[in-house]
Interface confidence: low
């Protein structure tokens, strides 16, 4: 049999795994789709992105609201032609998440 | 130009983005490779997995040490033939990470 305490522990873990904005490391260059001769240092920044589990396999954890936050990064051109420049880079930050269907349902499916 | 304080902020952020064990939500069924008629509730658990950035594109963040932690979950067989049973499930938990080459170098490359 299972006692209340065990169920509480399981429930708490489940709450923590659910679809929500989570601090994630994202690669700036791939985010911005920059040319290959431009690099950012640091190459990654911490932002919140939707992640976690949904109750059903047909659902996916997706963002419902987004803000854009500015991160100060060095933009470096290769070959190095000047002192690395500090530039503000805007990166998407998920502020709301929801378990949504993986694809819109066909009206007559 | 950039001042020392700005660099400190960037440095702190960089430290936080680097390859290290991070709390991650993993799907138990896919972890264990269970048959499609067996489900776990909750379907996901929190464990530490290697994640974050490496300084070079040729490197990938990989685990160097792993422990296995036991999580209490309900195992449910479909069709439901008995009361869901609480079972201990062992899940890999990364305890050490390192930026390693994506593929072993060829001895004569």
């Amino acid at each position: 049999f299972y006692d209340i305490e065990t169920l509480k522990v399981i429930d708490e873990e489940w709450q923590r795994t659910q679809c929500s904005p989570r601090e994630t490391c994202v690669e700036v260059a791939s985010e911005l789709g920059k040319s290959t001769n431009t690099f950012f240092k640091p190459p990654c920044v911490n932002v919140f992105r939707c992640g976690g589990c949904c109750n059903e396999e047909s659902l996916i954890c997706m963002n419902t609201s987004t803000s854009y936050i500015s991160k100060q990064l060095f933009e470096i051109s290769v070959p190095l032609t000047s002192v690395p420049e500090l530039v503000p880079v805007k990166v998407a930050n998920h502020t709301g998440c929801k378990c949504l269907p993986t694809a819109p349902r066909h009206p007559y499916s | 130009f950039y001042d020392i304080e700005t660099l400190k902020v960037i440095d702190e952020e960089w430290q936080r983005t680097q390859c290290s064990p991070r709390e991650t939500c993993v799907e138990v069924a896919s972890e264990l490779g269970k048959s499609t008629n067996t489900f776990f509730k909750p379907p996901c658990v929190n464990v530490f997995r290697c994640g974050g950035c490496c300084n070079e594109e040729s490197l990938i963040c990989m685990n160097t040490s792993t422990s296995y932690i036991s999580k209490q979950l309900f195992e449910i067989s479909v069709p439901l033939t008995s009361v869901p049973e609480l079972v201990p499930v062992k899940v890999a938990n990364h305890t050490g990470c390192k930026c390693l080459p994506t593929a072993p170098r060829h001895p004569y490359s």
Partner: antibody, heavy 117, light 112 residues
Framework: QVTLKESGPALVKPTQTLTLTCTFS??????????VGWIRQPPGKALEWLAN???????YYNPVLRSRLTISKDTSKNQVVLTMTNMDPVDTATYYC?????????WGQGTLVTVSS | DIVMTQTPLSLPVTPGEPASISCRSS???????????LHWYLQKPGQSPQLLIY???NRFSGVPDRFSGSGSGTDFTLKISRVEAEDVGVYFC?????????FGGGTKVEIK
Amino acid sequence: QVTLKESGPALVKPTQTLTLTCTFSGFSLSTYGMGVGWIRQPPGKALEWLANIWWNDDKYYNPVLRSRLTISKDTSKNQVVLTMTNMDPVDTATYYCVQVTNPFVFWGQGTLVTVSS
Amino acid sequence: DIVMTQTPLSLPVTPGEPASISCRSSQSLVHINGNTYLHWYLQKPGQSPQLLIYKVSNRFSGVPDRFSGSGSGTDFTLKISRVEAEDVGVYFCSQSTHVPWTFGGGTKVEIK
């Protein structure tokens, strides 16, 4: 507060190697994006950039002088060392250590090096 | 290397009068990121150079507003609207768009 101070011999003989040390405070060369460099100025003449070293140990040299220059750092001591081989009287100059930002904001007081036999 | 040519070499000035220094580069100083890394420094007698203007026209903190920078591409100007006695020294332009970073030959500003 950022300070940089150069030290080294005031006089070197032709063909000898010059070793200059920059000791700095107010910042760390292990901090992401930080750099320290060297610039020289012959008496009454223009400034000339020589070399710099970054936090990640990347080094950049003035191509004209690259074969004669070596820059290195000791992060724990907050020091950067520049060596210049095969000194000549035309290398007589005030040598400045700078914190490498774009542009150069913090400079050392400079050290005058005379090359003479 | 980018050659930075400053004119005049020497500039005798009267306190309260304006002064202008020209700096010309052998190539455009517009970086591929769109910025122009042309800076102005003042070296007072017996001192290290100090930053006045960065990226063509931005006054560095603490620099009096009588100093202004302008220009684009290859032609740049530093202006002092009303020269004061403390402004004497050698003025250098500098570029950090292209490696190696280079400096102009200097303009010596002295009181008449």
